[in-house]
Structure formats: C-alpha cells, structure tokens
Amino acid sequence: APTSSSTKKTQLQLEHLLLDLQMILNGINNYKNPKLTRMLTFKFYMPKKATELKHLQCLEEELKPLEEVLNLAQSKNFHLRPRDLISNINVIVLELKGSETTFMCEYADETATIVEFLNRWITFCQSIISTLT
C-alpha cells in the first residue's frame, strides 16, 4: 500500500513534470515565436486512455519527437536546451510509471498538434495530482 511519503514524492514528481510541460507550452505559444506555424505542422500520437501513471508510457514514447520539434524554436538562444528538458522529463516519467511492469501504449486514431499534445499531458498531470491531494 502507498505510504504518505511515497504519495508525497509522487505528487512532487507530477508537479515537476507539470511545470516543465507548462513552460514548454509557454515557449511554443509565445506570440513572438517565429517557428510556431512550422511547429504546428508536426503530428503527435495521443493516448487512447490516460488515467493512471502506467499510461505515461505513451508520453515516454513521444519524447524524442517532442525534442526534435522543440529544437526548431531558437537554436542559438536556449536558456534550457530541449535535450535538458527532455532528459529531466524522461527521468521523472520513468520514476512515475515504474519499470517493473511492461505496458503497451494504445494510441487514439487521430494525431494532434504539439499544443494539443502538451495540453493533454498537462491535464493528465493535474488530474492525477488532484486525486493525491
């Protein structure tokens, strides 16, 4: 059974994941982002279902494509390079979903833009956090 300390750790990890996803979205939605139109042409796979931590497998599988799109932004002017962000997100995702069980991700038929993709996973984090508090 989960202890209060493990629940607290999970909550903190989800909050960190949420914050980095939100910051990425802030950067993409920046009204002066000249690459936004190009970024929106890339398609991302969305999970058919995302209600449990194991479903983070679906996010993990899309992290490499996400990094590639983020690299379009402002190559010479990164405060945080996409590889720094994706590396941190990957570590959090692996810890949250665990590596013991193998979960085969099921994707929805429709693909999504990077904005829709990020918003979906932001909503996921917020939803799980709300069940822990």
């Epitope: 960190h16 994941l17 949420l18 914050l19 980095d20 996803l21 939100q22 910051m23 990425i24 802030n26 950067g27 920046n30 002066k32 983020l70 932004a73 402002q74 002017n77 990164f78 405060h79 945080l80 996409p82 720094d84 962000l85 590396s87 941190n88 997100i89 959090i92």
Partner: nanobody, 119 residues
Framework: EVQLLESGGGLVQPGGSLRLSCAAS????????MGWYRQAPGKQRELVAV???????NYADSVKGRFTISRDNSKNTVYLQMNSLRAEDTAVYYC?????????????WGQGTLVTVSS
C-alpha cells in the same frame, strides 16, 4: 512586471567559494526558468547556469563540476553555489527570469552582482 533581487557577490580568492541568490517577485508564472548569466569586461553576456521550476538544468561547459544551481519554488528563489573559483570567473553575474525555455523579449534581468576572483 517581475522584480529580481540579487545578492551574494563579492571578492574571493582563487579556489574559494561564493553563493549567489536571486529572489523573484511580482507577476510570476509558476512554470518558469531562472538562472545566471555573466558578463566579463569587454566580453558578451554568456550563460552560466539555468534551472526550470520542474528541475531541468543547463550549465556552461566552463562551470560544470564547479558550480551548482538550485532553487526553492515556494520562495521563487534561485541559488548558484560557486566552488573552486578562478580568475576567469570574474564578471558581473545577472539573474534571469523567463516564462520560456528560450530567450524572448519578455525575459527579465537583474541589476547584476559583481564577482571578483583575485589574490
């Protein structure tokens, strides 16, 4: 509007340590990047270290293994622990706050704090 209050600069001998702090206040996004850039006399401003509120970090190659960036999200404060300081670390260190992972015109910068490494 975001205000940045820096502290911790000063004179230190080569091999010594300093800790810089920067507290952000005002219209803060909870999701942000904060960190430190520096400018030595006659040189361009360069990245030292940046950390996101989610814990992602980026360090300049020249400070890796010597400097450590950390933050307290509850206080909107970022810290830079600088160890094994060298003469070439002498510069004005500027705190930076951004709502994005890359440079934007909406980024905020502190007034700067002088770090002098000299015997």
């Amino acid at each position: 509007e975001v205000q940045l209050l820096e502290s911790g600069g000063g004179l230190v001998q080569p091999g010594g340590s300093l800790r810089l702090s920067c507290a952000a206040s005002g219209s803060i996004f909870s999701a942000n990047a904060m960190g430190w850039y520096r400018q030595a006399p006659g040189k361009q401003r360069e990245l030292v270290a940046v950390i996101s509120s989610g814990g992602s970090t980026n360090y300049a190659d020249s400070v890796k293994g010597r400097f450590t960036i950390s933050r307290d999200n509850s206080k909107n404060t970022v810290y830079l622990q600088m160890n094994s300081l060298r003469a070439e670390d002498t510069a004005v260190y500027y705190c930076m706050y951004s709502g994005s992972y890359y440079y934007t015109p909406n980024d905020y910068w502190g007034q700067g704090t002088l770090v002098t490494v000299s015997s």
